[in-house]
Structures are given as structure tokens and as C-alpha cells.
């Protein structure tokens, strides 16, 4: 017998859509072979209607698709706008139509429920609103208006014009009688439930002259949209529930056991602990739509997600909802990278960020996730030479090692740097990744003076002491600027005496600045690396002042002053306020990217779900003239 499995019978009605799942053993060969959906002919052949290789029959043009989910060993055939002509016997299968790897499916499309003459059909999504219109004649204008629901053989009163409301509809139904000019009354039912579906009868008057109108209410549960994303990658759920719920609390929940739907995030400030640091609820538009971004996808994130609107911020019967079935592909194109990076206070971290190697020219960003409200991620640095002012001299984004990975170095760590950071680009939005920085107890490995003052025209020598554990590493000095850290010549002065219990392999490497000029003022880093992979760094601020007496300065660890409290920008720069404008590309929308660098006089984009808030100053490597 065939190992392919699926629904033997599918019954639907005209105008509807069907979503037929076919199951196959997920062997390597099966995963990659052709998938097809064909219609069986009277003479035994099977005519292909759609296949995974891109073929779509003219009969299915614009109304069908076939999606393969190799990780689960399934493929799904969606067919919309069904007509009775679609009724028949079909096969879903693998390989060639005439071979045995297939499953027989009977599709029956009927005209719809057996409706009484003159029945108006209302097809409405779960949680939405329906308005049932009931015409009447003049002689019944002053008489009682009512709506009944057919339960089995008996009509049950739902609402009438004398004020009765059936308890099942309390708080979500009203009866409106139009102005005198219109011979029509309407019954409006909100927050539709699946149990509301059925045959209704509206009536004006109670005698033999009463006017009656039949209505058939079909309440559709949303078919989950299938979403297939890579492990460690990112997913965006776009939720459009309509303007009628624009002011109602929104939520995203994940169905667990039974009808329980555990809130993942909502607009009332709730967020599931498992999503801490890797979720943002993008602010809703005026039409009530919103989106939720989840990064760092894990295997256990797979499942059915519902977004909806309800004052409680969680799923209730009658919530308008949208549904997704998320599959997390473990054969991920996104490489493994550490999800937690630990750094010692006063020292540094070097974070490796993956990106889609096909997009090497994309702009790279690094942002700090903030949990307040619905989550936001203001940018700290980008690959175009912008660094947030508070991070000057201690944060750098490097294109190295390249080929699908960039590096972010953050030094002068304090406990306030602990938190979640996102790596992202203005390209493939699925490649957003999250890393948590933890600050741990300990001493920095590299020893440098605090801040140093150099004298114009003189020579300055700044020491950096490397312990023996870094004997096999390349040691360097560089000058920090917004675009990175430009390497400088340095001198190996032999073993360092700054470390106890450290042998001849420790090293003192000095930076020498000859004939110091004003341009030498700024931040200098010493650090270690292996090839294009960076390790620990330490930062020194060099101030430049005038001095009458000539000579050179040689700075030791003992002579070092405390680091300056505040760095004053030279007059050629000005601090640029960051208005946290929303970069639409940071939320998976297929729009062209405008370079946000010079928008709003140099303000920067932020992955943000709050209002426009001041982000603090920012600096750039080019001058802004007033």
C-alpha cells in the first residue's frame, strides 16, 4: 500500500476554499522529489493540476497553490473559489503521476446548505460583526419585530423590539429600526461565535400577515496560514483585525493544550517569559492592524498562534482572530552563534552577528531590546558610520570576518549594559538574531591607564598589558572612530610586570604618538584577535593640551587619571537628536529602503513600538554645519 496519507473525503460549498494536507515519509529523497495534485479521469489517467515544480493548470490559475513542508513530511494544496465543477476524484502524490506513490482524495463541492427560498446567506469570520437586514411592509411598521434562531425543529427567540434578548447574546446584539422612510429593521450581532452559525428567521408582526425573511449565518473559523521559518531566525505575524477593534486591546497567543491559548504578548503589557528579549509588538495603525516580530526562533516556538482583540488582552469566545501554524525548520540556513555572551565589568565583549551572505552590501545594525510597553529596539550603531552618542569610544561595528558574519565590539562594560541585543540588516528580515549580554564578576584581562593627557608637539607612549593567556593572539592598538577602529603601529616592549603568576609570555605593547596634534585626541583601543575574529579590548581616552616645556610623556598604569565623566565633542560636530523614527524595513514589509541617515536632520531609525521619543544624542563621522 502507498505510504502517502491524506483526507479521503473533502466536502465543501461553492465559493469556499479548501486546504488539503498530504503526508509522506520525510526521507531525504521524498523531501526533494516532485509533489503533485492531479484529477483522475474516467479512463484512469490523472491530469496534473498543480505541482511543486511550478506548473499550474489554466483551471487553477490564480486560485490554487502547492506548498511543500519537507521538515514535517507534508505538502498542502490550497484551492480557492470552489465551484461544483471542482467535484471529483483526485490524487496527491510524489514523483510521477502514473507511479504508486499517491493517495486518493474525493472532493465534493455542493451548492451550499439546503436553504429555503429567498434565504439570504451571511458568511462572516469568527469574532466579527454581522448585520441581518429584515424588510417589512407598511402594515407591520408599528408591530413587534423579532429574530428567531432555528434550533433543531424549533425557532428560539433571539431578540425582539420589546427589549427581550436571549441570554446567549447578552451584551453583543441590538435591534435597529430604520427611520420612517425605510421599511427595514436590522439585527446587529457582534463578537460572533461558532455557535451563532445557523438558520435565522426575522419577522415583523405576529399574525398571518406578518413579514418573514430567512437568513443563513455561516461563521468561519480562520484557516491557519502556514508559516515556515528557520531555526534561530525571525518571524513576523501581521495581524489585521479591522477598524472596528482599533481601540480594543490586542494580543498574540500560542495554543497549548486544549482550547488554552497562552498570551505571548499583548498591548496591556503582558509578555511571556520565554519571549523575553526576542519579541516586539509593533504599534497598531489607525485601522487596528499590528505586527509581532519574534527573533531567535527555537524548536519549541513551533505551533499554532492566534492574534486577536479583546478588552482582557487574551483569547475569549467572540474575539476576532487570525491564525498561523508556525513550523520551525531545523535544517536552518542561519548558523549557530552564541545566544549568551558574558563580559566582565570594565572589560569588553565581541559579538558575532550572522547575516544573509547574499546581502553583503546591506546595512548592518545593532540595537538594544527594551521591554517597556510592547518592546522596542533603539539602534546603537550601524555599518554606515553612525554610533549613538552615549556609546562613543566604546562601541564598534566591524564588517569582519565577512561572508555572512559581522562583529560588534562593546567595551568599558558596566552592569547597565546587561540585556538583550538584536543583530539585523536592512535586507533579509528573517535574519534577525538575538544575543543576551551578561555582566559577570571578575577583572579585565587587559590593563591600560584610565585617561591620558598628551602635550601638543610631544611624544606620547601608552602601555597595554596583555596576560600570558593571550600569548598566541595578535595584539593591536587602534584609534576608534564612528566607522570602526583604524589600526596603528605599536611596539612590543617585552614581558609585562603587571601580572602575578604570569610567565614570560605576558606582554607589554605600547602605542606611541609622535609629535602629538589636536587630531590625535580621542579614544584608543588595545585588543587581541585571531585572524578576523576579535577578542577582548580595552579603551583609553587621550586628551591633548598645550604645554610650554618640551619633552615626551610616558604613561604608566600608576599615573593614570580617572576616565573623563563626559566627552565634549569638538566644535566641528554637534549632537544629533535621534527621534526613533520607524524604519519600515525593520518590520518585514516589502518596501524600498530609504537611507534614513539624513532624514529629519540626521535622526535615526529604531526598531520601535513606542511613540516618537528622544533617544539621546548621536554622532557621525561626517560634519554637520549649522
Amino acid at each position: 500500500k502507498s505510504p502517502i496519507f491524506g483526507p479521503e473525503e473533502v466536502n465543501s460549498v461553492e465559493g469556499n476554499s479548501v486546504s488539503i494536507t498530504c503526508y509522506y515519509p520525510p526521507t531525504s529523497v521524498n523531501r526533494h522529489t516532485r509533489k503533485y495534485w492531479c484529477r483522475q479521469g474516467a479512463r484512469g489517467g490523472c491530469i496534473t493540476l498543480i505541482s511543486s515544480e511550478g506548473y499550474v493548470s489554466s483551471k487553477y490559475a490564480g486560485r490554487a497553490n502547492l506548498t511543500n513542508f519537507p521538515e514535517n513530511g507534508t505538502f498542502v494544496v490550497n484551492i480557492a473559489q470552489l465551484s461544483q465543477d471542482d467535484s471529483g476524484r483526485y490524487k496527491c502524490g510524489l514523483g510521477i503521476n502514473s507511479r504508486g506513490l499517491s493517495f486518493d482524495v474525493s472532493l465534493e463541492v455542493s451548492q451550499g446548505p439546503g436553504l429555503l427560498n429567498d434565504t439570504k446567506v451571511y458568511t462572516v469570520d469568527l469574532g466579527r460583526t454581522v448585520t441581518i437586514n429584515c424588510p417589512f411592509k407598511t402594515e407591520n411598521a408599528q408591530k413587534r419585530k423579532s429574530l428567531y434562531k432555528q434550533i433543531g425543529l424549533y425557532p428560539v427567540l433571539v431578540i425582539d423590539s420589546s427589549g427581550y434578548v436571549n441570554p446567549n447574546y447578552t451584551g453583543r446584539i441590538r435591534l435597529d429600526i430604520q427611520g420612517t422612510g425605510q421599511l427595514l429593521f436590522s439585527v446587529v450581532i457582534n463578537q460572533l461565535r461558532l455557535s451563532d452559525a445557523g438558520q435565522y428567521l426575522c419577522q415583523a408582526g405576529d399574525d398571518s400577515n406578518s413579514n418573514k425573511k430567512n437568513a443563513d449565518l455561516q461563521v468561519l473559523k480562520p484557516e491557519p496560514e502556514l508559516v515556515y521559518e528557520d531555526l534561530r531566525g525571525s518571524v513576523t505575524f501581521h495581524c489585521a483585525l479591522g477598524p472596528e477593534v482599533a481601540n480594543v486591546a490586542k494580543f498574540l497567543c500560542r495554543q497549548s493544550s486544549g482550547e488554552n491559548c497562552d498570551v505571548v504578548v499583548n498591548t496591556l503589557g503582558k509578555r511571556a517569559p520565554a519571549f523575553e528579549g526576542r519579541i516586539l509588538l509593533n504599534p497598531q495603525d489607525k485601522d487596528g492592524s499590528f505586527s509581532v516580530v519574534i527573533t531567535g526562533l527555537r524548536k519549541e516556538d513551533a505551533g499554532r498562534y492566534l492574534c486577536g482583540a479583546h478588552s482582557d488582552g487574551q483569547l475569549q469566545e467572540g474575539s476576532p482572530i487570525q491564525a498561523w501554524q508556525l513550523f520551525v525548520n531545523e535544517e536552518s540556513t542561519i548558523p549557530r552563534s552564541p545566544t549568551v555572551v558574558k563580559g566582565v565589568a570594565g572589560s569588553s565583549v565581541a559579538v558575532l552577528c550572522p547575516y544573509n551572505r547574499k546581502e553583503s552590501k546591506s546595512i548592518k545594525y545593532w540595537c538594544l531590546w527594551e521591554g517597556a510597553q510592547n518592546g522596542r529596539c533603539p539602534l546603537l550603531v550601524d555599518s554606515e558610520g553612525w554610533v549613538k552618542a552615549q556609546y562613543e569610544g566604546r562601541l564598534s561595528l566591524l564588517e569582519e570576518p565577512g561572508n555572512g558574519t559581522f562583529t560588534v565590539i562593546l567595551n568599558q562594560l558596566t552592569s547597565r549594559d546587561a540585556g538583550f541585543y538584536w543583530c539585523l540588516t536592512n535586507g533579509d528580515t528573517l535574519w534577525r538574531t538575538t544575543v543576551e549580554i551578561k555582566i559577570i564578576e571578575g577583572e579585565p584581562n587587559l590593563k591600560v591607564p584610565g585617561n591620558v593627557t598628551a602635550v601638543l608637539g610631544e611624544t606620547l607612549k601608552v602601555p597595554c598589558h596583555f596576560p600570558c593567556k593571550f600569548s598566541s593572539y595578535e595584539k593591536y592598538w587602534c584609534k576608534w572612530n564612528n566607522t570602526g577602529c583604524q589600526a596603528l603601529p605599536s611596539q612590543d616592549e617585552g614581558p609585562s610586570k603587571a601580572f602575578v603568576n604570569c610567565d614570560e609570555n605576558s606582554r607589554l605593547v605600547s602605542l606611541t604618538l609622535n609629535l602629538v596634534t589636536r587630531a590625535d585626541e580621542g579614544w584608543y583601543w588595545c585588543g587581541v584577535k585571531q585572524g578576523h575574529f576579535y577578542g577582548e579590548t580595552a579603551a583609553v581616552y587621550v586628551a591633548v593640551e598645550e604645554r610650554k616645556a618640551a619633552g615626551s610623556r610616558d604613561v604608566s598604569l600608576a599615573k593614570a587619571d580617572a576616565a573623563p565623566d563626559e566627552k565634549v565633542l569638538d566644535s566641528g560636530f554637534r549632537e544629533i537628536e535621534n527621534k526613533a523614527i520607524q524604519d519600515p524595513r525593520l518590520f518585514a514589509e516589502e518596501k524600498a529602503v530609504a537611507d534614513t541617515r539624513d532624514q529629519a536632520d540626521g535622526s535615526r531609525a529604531s526598531v520601535d513600538s513606542g511613540s516618537s521619543e528622544e533617544q539621546g544624542g548621536s554622532s557621525r563621522h561626517h560634519h554637520h554645519h549649522h
Partner: nanobody, 126 residues
Framework: EVQLVESGGGLVQAGDSLRLSCAAS????????VGWFRQAPGKEREFVTT??????????YYADSVKGRFTISRDNAKNTVYLQMNSLKPDDTAVYYC?????????????????WGQGTQVTVSS
């Protein structure tokens, strides 16, 4: 919570018919599919049939061993799913369980179902 109650089991002769019912109560508004499984003494629970739905579309799945003999159906108004069993064989003897699911990735897998009834005994004598 969703409660499921099976009924209609009993003792029949080979070749006879039987109709099982599964009545659901409680918060059924998120239910997506209802299936029947069976378990014979000393054997594992096995898939028999499942019906899933979306709006007015129904999908019916059957195990090879019951194809052409068993039919699953549902009555939405009564929140009840039926299993019509024709041409019964002694091999069909088992406790039949009704199960409901909110998310069904593969209808044949018992662990995909969130709610289970207590079961009803079907005995087919030769």
C-alpha cells in the same frame, strides 16, 4: 475545558452495523477536529478515523483497515460526531475512544489530541 462522552458501543455479530456517538460539551469554540481511536487488549491505541473542519468545509481521514466500511460525520448543531461502522469484523473488537484537538498537525497521531473520552466497548463476535 472540553468534555467528550462516547455512546453506542455493544456486542454485535460479524457483518452487523453499529453507530457510535461522541458528544462534546464545554468550551468547544476552538476545537478543530474530532477523531476516533481504538485499543484492543494488549495492543497500542490505533487511529481509526478523524474529521476536521473549517467553516463549512469538512475533511475526513480513514485508516486503511476501515476504508469503505466506516464513515465519520458530524452534527454541528448538536456538537456531536458519529462513527457509522458497517460490515464489522471480529478484528474490530476494541474500546473505541473519541478525541478532540485544537491543532492537528497529523490526524493519525494520538498525542496531537488534547481531549479524550472514557471510551466505549465494541465487541464483534464471529
Amino acid at each position: 475545558e472540553v468534555q467528550l462522552v462516547e455512546s453506542g458501543g455493544g456486542l454485535v455479530q460479524a457483518g452487523d452495523s453499529l453507530r457510535l456517538s461522541c458528544a462534546a460539551s464545554g468550551r468547544t469554540f476552538t476545537t478543530y477536529g474530532v477523531g476516533w481511536f481504538r485499543q484492543a487488549p494488549g495492543k497500542e491505541r490505533e487511529f481509526v478515523t478523524t474529521i476536521t473542519w473549517s467553516g463549512s468545509t469538512n475533511y475526513k481521514y480513514y485508516a486503511d483497515s476501515v476504508k469503505g466500511r466506516f464513515t465519520i460525520s458530524r452534527d454541528n448543531a448538536k456538537n456531536t460526531v458519529y462513527l457509522q461502522m458497517n460490515s464489522l469484523k471480529p478484528d474490530d473488537t476494541a474500546v473505541y475512544y473519541c478525541a478532540a484537538s485544537t491543532v492537528l498537525t497529523d490526524p493519525r497521531v494520538p498525542t496531537e489530541y488534547d481531549y479524550w473520552g472514557q471510551g466505549t466497548q465494541v465487541t464483534v463476535s464471529s
